[in-house]
């Protein structure tokens, strides 16, 4: 069933107790949203405004450069993933406002949250791809001169999107609408029913491929880049460190609650107190993860402008300088202004 003949119910949220008292009225209402949900709504609103504008600007700037500069390809894909995620936020916002009621039908329940998940994972995996590119620029400059081209960059992006799609399939397949009898409400969520093992497997795969692996990639890549930077006594090593900390820390901080609660819920009984507590925090964890969708443009702009007062320039002009800079290796572009100088020193030295 794709849609329900849903009428605004007579009842709000209830905390059901185990006692049976048949002589009390049924019309006690409580329509207040929980504190975690209110916080989630605030975060969603901010992320939507900043994310849509910020990523739209990045897409606009990088789209013109994507044919000839590799960095523009990375940032274009990353911004598209974040931008698409942000577009789905009004749907999530509306659902939370209505106490998690889902008035958008079964098809929308399968597609929209899965699309959000697709884009979120695409963002993570693209960050890992960019990190690998940074690593190769520093440690394999000769290889980069020979093979690092726009075609390969697009293939890498396609692989990232493809893997993100694979990670999203279980969510799409198991997503269902459930119309609860009381309070009258349609919910959109995943239902593994008889297969708890499959639910756990999906959660573990999601944690490993969507969080731990990219985290490991980022950490290793930037650790080696940092070590090389320090060993060459690069003049801008502290600036590089700031970029590394910003990228890795934002990844860590904003995705950690979502992944931890997700894996915990897959191992808990749905009726357990811990599960119910985590479920109440679910929207907040999702909104917290969504900060990634608007933080990336901010990180790149702040790090890229190198605190040199370039904010006096127009924002598109600033972004163009940051996202489409030439690097020493062929036509490849640097990740940020801070790494450009250190890359130059390293490629000359290696």
């Amino acid at each position: 069933m794709d849609s329900f003949n849903y009428t605004t119910p007579d009842y709000g949220h209830y905390d059901d107790k185990d006692t049976l008292d048949l002589n009390t009225p049924v019309d006690k209402t409580s329509n207040t949203l929980r504190v975690p949900d209110i916080l989630a709504l605030v975060i969603f609103a901010v992320v939507f405004l900043v994310g849509v504008l910020g990523n739209a600007l990045v897409v606009w700037v990088t789209a013109f450069e994507a044919k000839r500069t590799i960095n523009a390809i990375w940032f274009l894909n990353l911004a598209v993933a974040d931008f698409l995620s942000c577009l789905a936020l009004p749907i999530l916002f509306t659902s939370i406002v209505q106490h998690h009621h889902w008035p958008f039908g079964g098809a929308a329940c399968s597609i929209l949250p899965s699309l959000i998940l697709l884009n979120m994972y695409a963002s993570i995996l693209l960050l890992a791809t960019i990190s690998a590119d940074r690593f190769l620029l520093v440690f394999k400059p000769i290889w980069c001169q020979n093979f690092r081209g726009a075609g390969l960059a697009w293939i890498a992006c396609a692989v990232a999107w493809g893997l993100a799609l694979l990670l999203t399939i279980p969510s799409f397949l198991y997503r269902v609408v459930r119309e609860e009898y009381f309070p009258p409400k349609v919910l959109c969520g995943v239902d593994y029913s008889h297969d708890k093992r499959r639910e756990r497997a999906v959660a573990i795969v999601r944690l490993v491929l969507g969080f731990l692996w990219p985290l490991l990639t980022l950490t290793i890549c930037y650790t080696f880049i940092l070590l090389r930077t320090w060993s060459r006594r690069a003049t801008r090593s502290t600036k590089t460190l700031k970029v590394v900390v910003a990228v890795v820390a934002s990844f860590f901080i904003f995705w950690l609650p979502y992944q931890v609660t997700g894996i915990m819920m897959s191992f808990l009984e749905p009726s357990s107190p811990t599960f119910l507590l985590l479920k109440k925090l679910d929207s907040l964890c999702v909104s917290f993860a969504y900060i990634n969708c608007c933080i990336n443009p901010i990180i790149y702009v702040v790090a890229g402008q190198g605190f040199q007062g370039r904010l006096r320039k127009s924002l598109p002009s600033l972004l163009r300088n940051v996202l489409t800079e030439e690097s020493v290796v062929r036509e490849s572009k640097s990740f940020t202004r801070s790494t450009v100088d250190t890359m130059a020193q390293k490629t000359q030295a290696v």
Epitope: P9, D16, L20, N23, D27, R178, Y181, F182, D191, S271
Partner: antibody
Framework: QVQLVQSGAEVKKPGASVKVSCKAS????????MHWVRQAPGQGLEWMGY????????KYAQKFQGRVTMTRDTSTSTVYMELSSLRSEDTAVYYC????????????????WGQGTTVTVSS | DVQMTQSPSSLSASVGDRVTITCRAS???????????LHWYQQKPGKAPKFLIY???NRFSGVPSRFSGSGSGTDFTLTISSLQPEDFATYYC?????????FGQGTKLEIK
């Protein structure tokens, strides 16, 4: 004591409509939802829908959508269930049942039932 | 819709026997509030159903202690510890978590 008294047996022709009543007593009528459940001969129980006597809000099972109408008369504490376009497979005993609740009044339980009304659809 | 499957569909037992009836839901019937609205009814021929157990394991007022319910998620059981002559009837499980509310097909308990 709580009582749900239903109207008498009905014999109807295919395509006709039937209206079954259920008079409540012994409790505050508007405080409890009223559901209708039917049972075909030798078969199990089948939920048809409910009515909230306080607001008039109704919810019908998809299977009966468009054919069933539930109404109430608060002055007489009576709920009505009308089923139209009758067919032979609608031959069943129709029960009205009150949904009780917990200490927040949530209507999660069918704690009291009417005696049942036999509806026979035959040409 | 949630399908409720009871087994066995009928069983013969003697007075004093311990009897177990199982009920399986086609999907999880855990409510978003954490409760499971799985109930059990007893029905005798020509009579309206009688409410026995609510929310998996809670006995309704006046229901003898020999009746007990258990289970979670999708699998549930009704146990009668020591059958009495008045217990021979048809038993139905029902879920009130999701719309439409659905019942099992019934388990007829007969005297051996």
């Amino acid at each position: 004591q709580v009582q749900l008294v239903q109207s008498g047996a009905e014999v109807k022709k295919p395509g006709a409509s039937v209206k079954v009543s259920c008079k409540a007593s012994g409790y505050t009528f508007t405080n409890y939802w009223m559901h209708w459940v039917r049972q075909a001969p030798g078969q199990g129980l089948e939920w048809m829908g409910y009515l909230n006597p306080s607001s008039g809000y109704t919810k019908y099972a998809q299977k009966f959508q468009g054919r069933v109408t539930m109404t109430r008369d608060t002055s007489t504490s009576t709920v009505y269930m009308e089923l139209s376009s009758l067919r032979s497979e609608d031959t069943a005993v129709y029960y009205c049942t009150r949904s009780g609740g917990d200490n927040y009044g949530n209507p999660y339980y069918f704690d009291r039932w009417g005696q049942g009304t036999t509806v026979t659809v035959s040409s | 819709d949630v399908q409720m499957t009871q087994s066995p569909s009928s069983l013969s037992a003697s007075v004093g026997d311990r009897v177990t009836i199982t009920c399986r839901a086609s999907q999880s019937i855990v409510h978003s509030n954490g409760n499971t609205y799985l109930h059990w009814y007893q029905q005798k021929p020509g009579k309206a159903p009688k409410f026995l157990i609510y929310k998996v394991s809670n006995r309704f007022s006046g229901v003898p202690s020999r009746f007990s319910g258990s289970g979670s998620g999708t699998d549930f059981t009704l146990t009668i510890s020591s059958l009495q002559p008045e217990d021979f009837a048809t038993y139905y499980c029902a879920q009130y978590t999701l719309v439409p509310l659905t019942f099992g097909q019934g388990t007829k308990l007969e005297i051996k």
